[in-house]
């Protein structure tokens, strides 16, 4: 093969929790170089040298060489966040290269502490007992201590604290959650003792109190949310569904939910009771189907909720918002980056949807005319366009294997929005169209920068 300079790729850990270890490792992959003569060096952003490096022997692959270098940085240094990247430098007879290698973001995030209390009828057994549940969520790093106080004094009996767990997240720093339960006697709860869940994290103390004195009257606890039909549901199911969500029910046997039209005429409502929640309350959902034209006309629909805990029915009214400007979306389909394909692992296809109004949009991916499983792609929530008030943009990312992409398989991004002439538009991309967006690449970069 002919002599060639290396191509550099940053290597960073997929795990976002280096706070649990004393050091953070990042690496640098040099690929496709010849001859086999390469020297790695690492520098901080300020150009000072990093000494704790480790090199790995080069490997011959397809007539060219590949090599990696790793650097170990103390967690506490990374945690201060002064350097968002380090620089990997490579010397090679056919040219020197350098690459910024991003450092993992180690967020120090405080816990959000919530205490769930039993309802009046939530005590069982003889003597009657129930549980107070304390949840600390969204914190990082994972080291945390949870304790319970009763009237300001530490409680030792009836405390169970679960293992700290990582929260399921698609992006951002890894955060953690922990649950602690305190089993209490009904006599203690009704005696209006003050219980406190105390959470100690990174030298700070977070406290949440709970007492039967502080539990709001039942007639004010129940909440009703009237949820309008989404464009996505209208587009997918061809039906316009009104949803009435009722939360914080202490009992479920006496709830009724009904939808009525502006003229008082009842709309057939189907009610579902959910399971009980951690705080021992129930939720109920009342759904009613209406004609899309009735919804689009701006007619008002009212949800009415009755329950034994309510002195009078609760009502919520909704209608389609008036005067919302319609702007159809522009749709751009971006093929995988060549650098990514060179890694021979996966291929990421991006569907960029911009400039639309209202914010309700539906994105779906198709392959050979068949919808792809939603697990294969992720679609962002619509976000306001910074340069165009009242308009929104969203993106959907489909990940396929590099082999699938290289077979020439076509992928279609289908976008549905009420401002589109036929309510739907689509864009298709495959390996052969890979280079065709190059003329607009700069424009896309600008879009991403927003």
């Amino acid at each position: 093969g002919s002599a060639s300079a290396p191509t550099l790729f940053p290597l960073v850990s997929c795990e976002n929790s280096p706070s649990d270890t004393s050091s953070v490792a990042v690496g640098c992959l040099a690929q496709d170089f010849l001859p086999d003569s390469i020297t790695f060096s690492w520098k901080y952003k300020n150009n000072s040298d990093i000494s704790s490096t480790r090199g790995f022997p080069s490997v011959l692959r397809g007539g060219k060489y590949a090599a990696t270098s790793q650097v170990l940085l103390p967690s506490k240094d990374v945690m201060q966040g002064t350097d968002e990247h380090v620089v990997c430098k490579v010397q090679h007879p056919n040219g020197n290269k350098e690459k910024n290698v991003p450092l993992p973001v180690i967020a120090e995030l405080p816990p959000k502490v919530s205490v769930f209390v039993p309802p009046r009828d939530g005590f069982f057994g003889n003597p009657r007992k129930s549980k107070l549940i304390c949840q600390a969520t969204g914190f990082s790093p994972r080291q945390i201590q949870v304790s319970w106080l009763r009237e300001g004094k530490q409680v030792g009996s009836g405390v169970t604290t679960d293992q700290v767990q990582a929260e399921a997240k698609e992006s951002g720093p890894t955060t953690y959650k922990v649950t602690s339960t305190l089993t209490i006697k009904e006599s203690d709860w009704l005696g209006q003792s003050m219980f406190t869940c105390r959470v100690d994290h990174r030298g700070l103390t977070f406290q949440q109190n709970a007492s039967s004195m502080c539990v709001p009257d039942q007639d004010t606890a129940i909440r009703v949310f009237a949820i309008p039909p989404s464009f996505a549901s209208i587009f997918l199911t061809k039906s316009t569904k009104l949803t009435c969500l009722v939360t914080d029910l202490t009992t479920y046997d006496s709830v009724t939910i009904s939808w009525t039209r502006q003229n008082g005429e009842a709309v057939k409502t189907h009610t579902n009771i959910s399971e009980s929640h951690p705080n021992a309350t129930f939720s109920a959902v009342g759904e009613a189907s209406i004609c899309e034209d009735d919804w689009n006309s701006g007619e008002r629909f009212t949800c009415t909720v009755t329950h034994t805990d309510l002195p009078s029915p609760l009502k919520q009214t909704i209608s389609r918002p008036k005067g919302v400007a319609l702007h159809r979306p522009d749709v751009y389909l971006l093929p995988p980056a060549r650098e990514q394909l060179n890694l021979r692992e996966s291929a990421t296809i991006t569907c960029l949807v911009t400039g639309f109004s209202p914010a309700d949009v539906f994105v779906q991916w198709m392959q050979r005319g068949q919808p792809l499983s939603p697990e294969k792609y992720v679609t962002s929530a619509p976000m306001p366009e910074p340069q165009a008030p009242g308009r929104y943009f969203a993106h959907s990312i489909l990940t396929v294997s590099e082999e699938e992409w290289n077979t020439g398989e076509t992928y279609t991004c289908v976008v549905a929005h009420e401002a589109l002439p036929n309510r739907v538009t689509e864009r298709t991309v495959d390996k052969s169209t890979e280079g065709e967006v190059s003329a607009d690449e700069e424009g896309f970069e600008n879009l991403w920068a927003t």
């Epitope: 057994g125 003889n126 003597p127 009657r128 007992k129 009763r150 009237e151 030792g156 009996s157 009836g158 089993t183 209490i184 006697k185 006599s187 203690d188 005696g191 003792s193």
Partner: antibody
Amino acid sequence: EVQLVQSGAEVKKPGESLKISCKGSGYSFTTYTISWVRQMPGKGLEWMGIIYPSDSDTIYSPSFQGQVTISADKSISTAYLQWSSLKASDTAMYYCARSSVVGFDVWGQGTLVTVSS
Amino acid sequence: DIQMTQSPSSLSASVGDRVTITCRASQSISSYLNWYQQKPGKAPKLLIYAASRLQSGVPSRFSGSGSGTDFTLTISSLQPEDFATYYCQQHLSWPETFGQGTKVEIK
């Protein structure tokens, strides 16, 4: 007749394990709870912990947490108190008692545990 | 934990005497207080629950009073079978705690 019958006296060596029992009869075993109470020689009563046989939920006194294990087998209406490694200081009379809203209304006859090398 | 303090720790009395034993809680326990009687070599027996209610089968010479933090057990006319140790116990919250006991002896 409502009663709790405990297993017989035990003589053990330090470091040995032990499980004593308390069998309920004459009432619905899962409707009530069972508490265990220790009485060291010449001393007062100390509440050790409680078990709800219906769901096996246990609550321990901080003084006994990790020192003993309370369990129950509702199919044979029996509660248990066990040690994995006895100490000389575990020498005492152990009572099981039926707990209810009013307190400990029925007591077992007691099991004397002697730990000596 | 809620501490229970009994007084006196022991007393000597004669048959027919009126005997009073007091119990104090380290914090308010409303009426969640029981009294037990224990005779040597026997299991304790519930006498009074909810501070003042007589357990079924217990003679009426036993009575209880009090609420909050201060409680009293009274034996209106001491009988020979009443010589024993008496314990108060709070059951408002876990851990349930007993007083250290009051031994009633024959004078």
